[in-house]
Interface confidence: low
């Protein structure tokens, strides 16, 4: 499927709007600290050149890959030596290295002021001044903050502000229509880019074939009616889908995304019963609906696994064989019966099987040695249990905001080196994990709550790998992909750790923390308790609970007070010396 | 058919440097972790070090860190080992191995071996 032109094919294939939204996103994506206005610049061009290759694919520059073109127009940027310091070494290098050495200097924690959201009257009119550029900025304030945010879906997202405003510009009250809708956007936003830096991360720490185990073993749960040979074809598609926007070919990827929902909607029937009301929306609404349909149901009549993976005396044939063929076979037989596993644990029993065959299959007895694999697979299946059994208990008898004060606690005290806003930010959406999956009925508790928590401890490892500080962080994040939530639940209190010294300028509070939404609030005191902590790692719970009750209360207090910067003052003085007595700092 | 050719082994004096290369054929080389491992004359096999897919993770067996490296390029379906401070215990049979760990998580899984190539360290 030669083109002669890839910008013309690609333009004709997206149509022009997404083929402009994708260009900026990719733009923002790689250069993240230039202004809007230069960014739209560099689009308007690249839009007006593709143009001239849709006339004309024969014409002069158009038979270049898209990574020459794209490169060479981000190297035409006049500050990127004094913006982006050695990022502007990339522009001496030659395609792919150019591409490569750009994805290499992207920012996963880039230091960008904090978007503020204005007031709602500013932000419907400045929507119905100039709506294009409204959306662009959208677009450009995401992709530069989340670089490797899912663009097909970020569009989709875009798609959704667009109809906010639409909506409730127009309505009689105006706040009350827009600002749920714009946190419920911030909180999806927030959670798909976290799921997209997962991808990215296991593709290039682990490479292609992990990922495609990870999908073998997710799609086989979501589509178990489906054959191996299907579920296969779909997995090599999504790799590749996934691979291309990790890898900045956002056109290609949005392209063959588009081409993979048609796929699944055309053959549905071999697939799966849940897709028909996805199938039937507009393309970015179906490509998101098909990402998140619910599990199929399992056929009734399947039988059991251990006919042919441990009964069967061809075992060890059929693995030297074709190992990754079987393997995958494995994956997909035991994950199609298992929804109630997490994708993780699917991918610690398949490791655990071939582990078992590759020294089996060497033994004098294969057989005799294989024979009781499934025996090693129930302590495997009964950690994250436990686990989630335990920490749903004390989720329900502490609620979401002492919970994650006690996950700040419990993780403060395994990594105290790694930064306070980072644990915060960390320990913050980990205890989100409870709210969103405990209310689940068990059958669902696990799939949602360990691949969840995969997914924001790959946080912890990316905002850690820009700065290392831990080697037991380092460890638990590199040395598997499956492993690394177990890896985190098995550190103890890290007893190598100097304490801080106290610093009374940490614990001195103002009266702006009385301005601030509940949130923002607890923020504020979730970073007090981390760095109590990280100067007393040796508190007990009931320490900490009473300094933190003594905290909650002084700022009550000082809220309340005619002269509140005076009683911060004052009343913090006391706190601190009160804190520092009960925690012997 | 999967293929691994050693090539670059030879004879070299204690102190000396030598590079090893590894051209291999008949599968994806970039979805593949891959290692080097040595026999000694009359001893068993030992792991000397690996590279993952991409080249992001590496890993040296003690008794040669510091003085060998190990790299591979993937648009040339190659990999090599570049040995410098040679002594006469780095003396061995020099094998290329591909490591078909499906999750290439925990231990490595060495599905195919070169023929391999034979470094002599000797004054």
């Known amino acids: 499927d030669a083109h002669k032109s890839e910008v013309a094919h690609r333009f004709k294939d997206l149509g022009e709007e997404n083929f402009k939204a994708l260009v900026l996103i990719a733009f923002a994506q790689y250069l993240q600290q230039c202004p809007f206005e230069d960014h739209v610049k560099l689009v308007n061009e690249v839009t007006e050149f593709a143009k001239t290759c849709v006339a004309d694919e024969s014409a002069e520059n158009c038979d270049k890959s898209l990574h020459t073109l794209f490169g060479d127009k981000l190297c035409t940027v006049a500050t990127l030596r004094e913006t982006y310091g050695e990022m502007a070494d990339c522009c001496a290098k030659q395609e792919p290295e150019r591409n490569e050495c750009f994805l290499q200097h992207k920012d996963d924690n880039p230091n960008l002021p904090r978007l503020v959201r204005p007031e709602v009257d500013v932000m419907c009119t400045a929507f119905h001044d100039n709506e294009e550029t409204f959306l662009k900025k959208y677009l450009y304030e995401i992709a530069r903050r989340h670089p490797y945010f899912y663009a097909p879906e970020l569009l989709f997202f875009a798609k959704r502000y667009k109809a906010a405003f639409t909506e409730c510009c127009q309505a009689a009250d105006k706040a009350a229509c827009l600002l749920p809708k714009l946190d419920e956007l911030r909180d999806e936003g927030k959670a798909s880019s976290a799921k997209q830096g997962l991808k990215c991360a296991s593709l290039q720490k682990f490479g292609e074939r992990a990922f495609k185990a990870w999908a073998v073993a997710r799609l086989s749960q979501r589509f178990p009616k489906a054959e191996f040979a299907e579920v296969s074809k779909l997995v090599t598609d999504l790799t590749k889908v996934h691979t291309e926007c990790c890898h900045g070919d956002l056109l290609e990827c949005a392209d063959d995304r588009a081409d993979l929902a048609k796929y699944i909607c055309e053959n549905q029937d071999s697939i799966s019963s849940k897709l028909k009301e996805c199938c039937e929306k507009p393309l970015l609404e179906k490509s998101h609906c098909i990402a998140e349909v619910e599990n199929d149901e399992m056929p009734a009549d399947l039988p059991s696994l251990a006919a042919d993976f441990v009964g069967s005396k061809d075992v060890c044939k059929n693995y030297a064989e074709a190992k990754d063929v079987f393997l995958g076979m494995f994956l997909y037989e035991y994950a199609r019966r298992h929804p109630d596993y997490s994708v993780v644990l699917l991918l610690r029993l398949a490791k655990t099987y071939e582990t078992t065959l590759e020294k089996c299959c060497a033994a004098a007895d294969p057989h005799e040695c294989y024979a009781k694999v499934f025996d090693e697979f129930k302590p495997l299946v009964e950690e994250p249990q436990n686990l989630i059994k335990q920490n749903c208990e004390l989720f329900e008898q502490l609620g979401e905001y002492k919970f994650q004060n006690a996950l700040l606690v419990r993780y403060t005290k395994k990594v105290p080196q790694v930064s306070t806003p980072t644990l915060v930010e960390v320990s913050r959406n980990l205890g989100k994990v409870g709210s969103k999956c405990c209310k689940h009925p068990e059958a669902k508790r696990m799939p949602c709550a360990e691949d969840c928590l995969s997914v924001f401890l790959n946080q912890l490892c990316v905002l850690h790998e820009k700065t290392p500080v831990s080697d037991r962080v380092t460890k638990c994040c590199t040395e598997s992909l499956v492993n690394g939530r177990p890896c985190f639940s098995a550190l103890e209190v890290d007893e190598t750790y100097v304490p801080k010294e106290f610093n009374a300028e940490t614990f001195t509070f103002h009266a702006d923390i009385c301005t601030l939404s509940e949130k923002e609030r607890q923020i504020k005191k979730q970073t007090a308790l981390v760095e109590l902590v990280k100067h007393k790692p040796k508190a007990t719970k009931e320490q900490l609970k009473a300094v933190m009750d003594d905290f909650a209360a002084f700022v009550e207090k000082c809220c309340k007070a005619d002269d509140k910067e005076t009683c911060f003052a004052e009343e913090g003085k006391k706190l601190v010396a009160a804190s520092q007595a009960a925690l012997g700092l | 058919e999967v293929q691994l050719v050693e090539s670059g082994g030879g004879l070299v004096q204690p102190g000396r440097s030598l590079r090893l290369s590894c051209a291999a054929s008949?599968?994806?080389?970039?979805?593949?972790?891959m290692h080097w491992v040595r026999q000694a004359p009359g001893k068993g096999l030992e792991w000397v070090s690996g590279?993952?897919?991409?080249?992001?993770?590496?890993t040296y067996a003690d008794s040669v860190k510091g003085r060998f490296t190990i790299s591979r390029d993937n648009a040339k379906n190659s990999l090599y080992l570049q040995m410098n401070s040679l002594r006469a215990e780095d003396t061995a049979l020099y094998y290329c191995?591909?490591?078909?760990?499906?999750?290439?998580?925990?231990?490595?899984?060495?599905?195919?071996w070169g023929q391999g190539t034979l470094v002599t360290v000797s004054s």
């Open positions: 590279i993952s897919w991409n080249g992001n993770k590496i």
């Open positions: 191995v591909r490591d078909s760990s499906l999750f290439i998580v925990g231990a490595p899984t060495f599905d195919h």
């Open positions: 008949g599968f994806t080389f970039h979805h593949y972790a």
